[in-house]
Interface confidence: medium
């Protein structure tokens, strides 16, 4: 049989952050190559990463077409053949379908992880500080422009701010439905800030990792009386 020497892929894993989406699997190929197929529940299968010796396939271009769709993916193990025309690959022999493994369903809007946010700036005016979170670009496109995280998630996305006096470790928190915080601070005190993106309606992957810490008295901030 043409498929006797092929090993089915296993440990299929979706790795997705801010919609950059890669399907990974094992094992490293020996005498075989892989082809990945992706489809929506109601759509046709589309082949990607033809006859690759990699154990990953970037499916971002497909899933960003509609991040609210549910996607199915599968990885075919295809025997590697030598022929008179040099190295060729065949989708099985005698019309056989090579072995494949299904990935779990992937719903980008629900499953993509939130990337680490970045504090764009902070500005102090008297005893108030305005902290602005960068509205990151995603790879989701509309009208030839890349949409931001806020564009895609709308009001489903909030940010949590952690802030504390440089001289102490007691953290306070604030939340915002936009990309800005306005918080009260003690005059004459320096504060440090870190933010986290959150989608409260999710059950998994609700929170991003914390942003890098930014502290007052460093370049990123601005002070006004």
């Amino acid at each position: 049989s043409g498929t006797t020497n092929t090993v089915a892929a296993y440990n299929l894993t979706w790795k997705s952050t801010n919609f950059k989406t890669i399907l990974e699997w094992e094992p490293k190929p020996v005498n075989q190559v892989y082809t990945v197929q992706i489809s929506t529940k109601s759509g046709d299968w589309k082949s990607k990463c033809f006859y690759t010796t990699d154990t990953e396939c970037d499916l971002t271009d497909e899933i960003v077409k509609d991040v609210k769709q549910t996607y199915l993916a599968r990885v075919f193990s295809v025997p590697w053949r030598n022929s008179t025309h040099g190295k060729e690959t065949l989708f099985g022999t005698h019309g056989e379908e090579p072995p494949f493994t299904n990935a779990r369903k992937f719903l980008p809007y629900r499953d993509t992880k939130l990337g680490q946010p970045t504090i764009q700036s902070f500005e102090q005016v008297g005893t108030k500080v305005n902290v602005t979170v960068e509205d990151e670009r995603t790879l989701v496109r509309r009208n030839n422009t890349f949409l931001s995280l806020r564009d895609v998630f709308g009001k489903d996305l909030i940010y949590t701010l952690y802030y504390w006096k440089s001289s102490s470790s007691g953290k306070k928190t604030a939340k915002t439905n936009t990309n800005e915080f306005l918080i009260d601070v003690d005059k004459g005190e320096n504060y440090c800030f870190s933010v986290q993106a959150v989608i409260p309606s999710r059950t998994v992957n609700r929170k991003s990792t914390d942003s890098p810490v930014e502290c007052m008295g460093q370049e990123k901030g601005e002070f006004r009386e």
């Epitope: 806020r150 564009d151 009001k155 439905n177 800005e180």
Partner: antibody
């Protein structure tokens, strides 16, 4: 066809609390945000705040300390309370539906259904 | 907050003419969250355009929106008698959601 019907006291004295209610007919509260907007006589529109069916709120920071917006899903209505009113709060108050429309990878937001407005006058 | 500045304050035109209304934001606004409304005396505002370019249901195609970033435009290609009203732009991307001061389109 969704319609918003609003009511509440039209004449208040300074320091009193303004209280308005907006009922949603022909549709559900769920899946939308519900806003209050006001318009002082001869002036432009000012957004006061909004509430989701789940009760999550967003307020205009300039009014936040005085505003409470609440929702009653059993009655399919939402309400506005504005405390410690002054003459500067005299306005026509509108309720509106803020629709999240998802299309081609992202959301649009717009107020597509409005109440007819309630005139509120604050005078001693 | 994002300040929306509309110009001109008043536009005096005749029926059949073209009206061009400007809305300038104090900082960049996602076009997804930019809308235009029409208001006639004694009435609630009425949605015309959402997402900066898309016409709301039932809005005639003489109304069109354009622009991005900080500059947005509402164009009425040929004014009809019922188009004389006040027009507001609005952003719903950053709290507080804000409206422009309005442009009154009046009969010349």
């Amino acid at each position: 066809q969704v319609q918003l019907q609003q009511w509440g006291a039209g004449l208040l004295k300074p320091s009193e609390t303004l209280s308005l209610t907006c009922a949603v007919y022909g549709g559900s509260l769920s899946g939308y945000y519900w806003s209050w907007i006001r318009q002082p006589p001869g002036k432009g529109l000012e957004w006061i705040g909004e509430i989701g069916a789940s009760g999550s709120t967003r307020y205009n920071p300039s009014l936040k300390s005085r505003v409470t917006i609440s929702v009653d899903t059993s009655k399919n209505q939402f309400s506005l309370k504005l405390s410690s009113v002054t003459a500067a709060d005299t306005a026509v108050y509108y309720c509106a539906r803020d629709t999240p429309y998802y299309y081609e990878g992202g959301y649009y937001y717009y107020m597509d259904v409005w109440g007819k407005g309630t005139t509120v006058t604050v005078s001693s | 907050e994002i300040v929306l500045t509309q110009s001109p304050g008043t536009l005096s035109l005749s029926p059949g003419e073209r009206a061009t209304l400007s809305c300038r934001a104090s900082q960049s606004v996602s076009s997804s969250f930019l809308a235009w409304y029409q208001q006639k005396p004694g009435q609630a505002p009425r949605l015309l355009i959402y997402g900066a370019y898309s016409r709301a249901t039932g809005i005639p195609d003489r109304f069109s929106g354009s622009g991005s970033g900080t500059d947005f435009t509402l164009t009425i290609s040929r004014l009809e008698p019922e188009d004389f009203a006040v027009y507001y732009c609005q952003q719903a991307g950053v709290v507080p959601y804000t409206f422009g001061g309005g442009t009154k389109v009046e009969i010349k």
